[in-house]
Every structure is written in structure tokens, then in C-alpha cells.
């Protein structure tokens, strides 16, 4: 069975999280996609979503979040710019497919944002160049208000045991090591 892994990204305030979620393009290319945060014991909360139908490689900006759906490649790119400590948390990409439940994508992202930065020029942690020039054509998409009750309603287990999600062959495996991303700005 495919493993739904949780990857940990450790970044400094002011840096940019720059990740991607892949999907089956034949199935979901033009479907609306969303970026959600999963708070302990709560329903996932949608922070941003693409337009409906999703436009190819057309950036959508909602606050500090930029979504770009390359549906000719089957990839949703998610950027969270100018990170703040309070952005720390567990995130996931989903595909809206009403009336069915949202379809969860690979992987979940455990984001840890810490204060300060090691500002040596050229270092991986350099946060002085984190300025994204967003095309002026970006739009704010309206996201569906509903969140499926069967999408994760509690924090994932702290053990490394595999836990099957409902109606799927996907397993959740916690990944304990940290990704210190190279110059995500």
C-alpha cells in the first residue's frame, strides 16, 4: 500500500515554505485544490484554494499563501511566504470533488517555524532574499465552506505505527527526521 508520509520542514521566520503535492492528472487536472491546516482535535481548516475549475499554472494568492496548479504535470505548488512562528503546524493538500469527500494528497507537511535566522550570506537559512514577485494577475479564489467529517479530525498518532485511513489503501507513517530545505525563498 502507498504510504501517506508526514514530512517535517524546519524554517526560520521570514523564510518561504515551497512544497508540492502530486495527483493523478487524468483524474484531477481541473479539479479545485486546497491547502489546509490540521489543528489538534479539530476539522482541517481550508486556508486557500485554486479556482474552479482550476486554471493551469495560474497563481492564486490568499494572504501569504500562493497556490499554483500545474495540471499539465499533475502538481500543485504551495508557497507560504514570510513565515511566522504561529504558522507552525500540520498541513495537507486536498482535492475538492463534491458531492464526494475531499481527496487527500501526498504528503502531509509538518511545518516548524522558529524565530531568528542565521544570516550568513549563502547559507541555507538565509532569509534576507525572501521576496516573491507575484504576478499582478493573481486572484483570490472562493473555497467551499464544507469540510468532510471523515477527513482527519484529530492529530495523527505520535507512534510510528501505520494507521489506515477510511476507505483507502493509504497508510500514514510518521517521518521523524527534519528537512532543512535549501534556500526556499
Amino acid at each position: 500500500a502507498t504510504k501517506l508520509t508526514e514530512e517535517k520542514y524546519e524554517l526560520k521566520e521570514g523564510q518561504t515554505l515551497d512544497v508540492k503535492c502530486d495527483y493523478t492528472l487524468e483524474k484531477f487536472a481541473s479539479s479545485q485544490k486546497a491547502w489546509q491546516i490540521i489543528r489538534d482535535g479539530e476539522m482541517p481548516k481550508t486556508l486557500a484554494c485554486t479556482e474552479r475549475p482550476s486554471k493551469n499554472s495560474h497563481p492564486v494568492q490568499v494572504g501569504r499563501i500562493i497556490l499554483e496548479d500545474y495540471h499539465d504535470h499533475g502538481l500543485l505548488r504551495v508557497r507560504m511566504v514570510n513565515l511566522q512562528v504561529e504558522d507552525s503546524g500540520l498541513y495537507q493538500c486536498v482535492i475538492y470533488q463534491p458531492p464526494k469527500e475531499p481527496h487527500m494528497l501526498f504528503d502531509r507537511i509538518r511545518l516548524v517555524v522558529t524565530k531568528g535566522f542565521s544570516g550568513t550570506p549563502g547559507s541555507n537559512e538565509n532569509s534576507t532574499q525572501n521576496v516573491y514577485k507575484i504576478p499582478p494577475t493573481t486572484t483570490k479564489a472562493l473555497c467551499p465552506l464544507y469540510t468532510s467529517p471523515r477527513t482527519v479530525t484529530q492529530a495523527p498518532p505520535k507512534s510510528t505505527a501505520d494507521v489506515s485511513t477510511p476507505d483507502s489503501e493509504i497508510n500514514l507513517t510518521n517521518v521523524t527526521d527534519i528537512i532543512r530545505v535549501p534556500v526556499f525563498n
Epitope: 512544497v19 502530486d22 499533475g74 535549501p182 534556500v183
Partner: antibody, heavy 122, light 107 residues
Framework: QVQLVQSGAEVTKPGASVKVSCKAS????????INWVRQATGQGLEWMGW????????GSVQKFRGRVTMTRDTSITTVYMELSSLRSDDTAVYYC???????????????WGQGTMVTVSS | DIQMTQSPSSLSASVGDRVTITCQAS??????LNWYQQKPGKAPKLLIY???TLETGVPSRFSGSGSGTDFTFTISSLQPEDIATYYC?????????FGGGTKVEIK
């Protein structure tokens, strides 16, 4: 050590298909994307597409769409790239290359296979 | 697609010389640029990622700089083993694209 080992050279006719394999070892196979890059003799590098060995999802550049199929066998940590309807201008060395962590927008290819020469000739 | 223009396409320098290669993107790519070295008959090798971060194990005579559309790759003191073709590659937008390459030879 971390390495990618590709299948041997192929000679094939126009219109046929070729399937190149890329065997990964020395790292967690399902955690990193595998990309395919080709290089015609004396020419530059051309990215063809990517595959996530965990999800099995893949994507390719527009010019190869409909002709390229990427698959994987996680039990033997191998990714395959099949190119169909071959033409003489598909003659090239085909490389597999490891990308970043599958969830990361970090497309740097840090490990490369040795390359597979594919010759398309009638 | 983003076009990557490398210059010069080839150069000849003496051992110990400082060698500079430039790569220009057709649009702003932030610092999403990698540099590779390819020796004849071999697969490319990653030297620099994120415009200026040296890959582990790569000699410090190699360096990269730049942001936006203009990037520079430098070999501070050319060595005989540096004879190769060097490529830049952008990853700011898909599809990923490479520069045309710069062939470096020894005088």
C-alpha cells in the same frame, strides 16, 4: 552507497517503443522523485518528466505527452520510462536522476544514472 | 517556457585562471537555479543548487551567485580536471529548463 543503475543500450526501429529501467539503491526509494532527462549526441540536456515512486503519480513535458509512460515497482526499487512511437530524433542518451524529497519544490538532481543510449534507426 | 541562455558557449583558459560563466533567464526565477558539470561520456553532476549553495563534496573553487534573471558561475582557479561542459537549470516554473551549456577547455 546511493546510486541509480540503468538498463543497457537499445537499438530500435521507428514506430517502435523502448522501455528503460532505473534501479535505485542506498536510500529510501519512495521518498525522492525520479526524473528523466535526455541528451542527443553533442546536444544539451532536456527534461522529460518526473515520477513520485511513493504515489506512482508522474508528469511529463508537453512534447512527450501521450508518448511517455513512467511506472515503478517498489518491491525492486525500480522506475521505468517507456517511450513509444519512436522517431529518429529520439536517438539520445536517456538519464534517470533523483530529484528532491517528493513533497519539496526543490528540483536539483543530485544522483544520476549512468545513462542508456537509445538508437532509433531503420 | 522559461528560456535559459548561457554564455559563452565555449571558452579556453589556462590552469589557475578564474573562469566565469553567465546564465540569463527569460523571466525572474528568484534564486531557483542549479549548476551541473558534465564530463565527456559521463552523466551530469550537481555542483550548486539554489543559485549559490555548494553541493556536499564539491570543491570550494566552484561558486555561484545571482538572483532574478542574471546568474554567474565561477571557477576561482581552473584545474585540469575541470574540463567539462557546464549547464544551468531553472526550477522556478515547470517545465524545468536547462541552459545550452558552456564547454570549458584548457589552453
Amino acid at each position: 552507497q546511493v546510486q541509480l543503475v540503468q538498463s543497457g543500450a537499445e537499438v530500435t526501429k521507428p514506430g517502435a517503443s523502448v522501455k528503460v529501467s532505473c534501479k535505485a539503491s542506498g536510500y529510501t526509494f519512495t521518498r525522492y522523485d525520479i526524473n528523466w532527462v535526455r541528451q542527443a549526441t553533442g546536444q544539451g540536456l532536456e527534461w522529460m518528466g518526473w515520477m513520485n515512486p511513493n504515489s506512482g503519480n508522474s508528469g511529463s513535458v508537453q512534447k512527450f505527452r501521450g508518448r511517455v509512460t513512467m511506472t515503478r515497482d517498489t518491491s525492486i526499487t525500480t522506475v521505468y520510462m517507456e517511450l513509444s512511437s519512436l522517431r529518429s530524433d529520439d536517438t539520445a542518451v536517456y538519464y534517470c536522476a533523483r530529484g528532491g524529497i517528493s513533497s519539496s519544490w526543490h528540483w536539483a538532481f543530485d544522483i544520476w544514472g549512468q545513462g542508456t543510449m537509445v538508437t532509433v534507426s531503420s | 517556457d522559461i528560456q535559459m541562455t548561457q554564455s559563452p558557449s565555449s571558452l579556453s583558459a589556462s590552469v589557475g585562471d578564474r573562469v566565469t560563466i553567465t546564465c540569463q533567464a527569460s523571466q525572474d526565477i528568484n534564486n531557483h537555479l542549479n549548476w551541473y558539470q558534465q564530463k565527456p561520456g559521463k552523466a551530469p553532476k550537481l555542483l550548486i543548487y539554489g543559485a549559490y549553495t555548494l553541493e556536499t563534496g564539491v570543491p570550494s573553487r566552484f561558486s555561484g551567485s545571482g538572483s532574478g534573471t542574471d546568474f554567474t558561475f565561477t571557477i576561482s582557479s581552473l584545474q585540469p580536471e575541470d574540463i567539462a561542459t557546464y549547464y544551468c537549470q531553472q526550477y522556478d516554473k515547470l517545465p524545468l529548463t536547462f541552459g545550452g551549456g558552456t564547454k570549458v577547455e584548457i589552453k
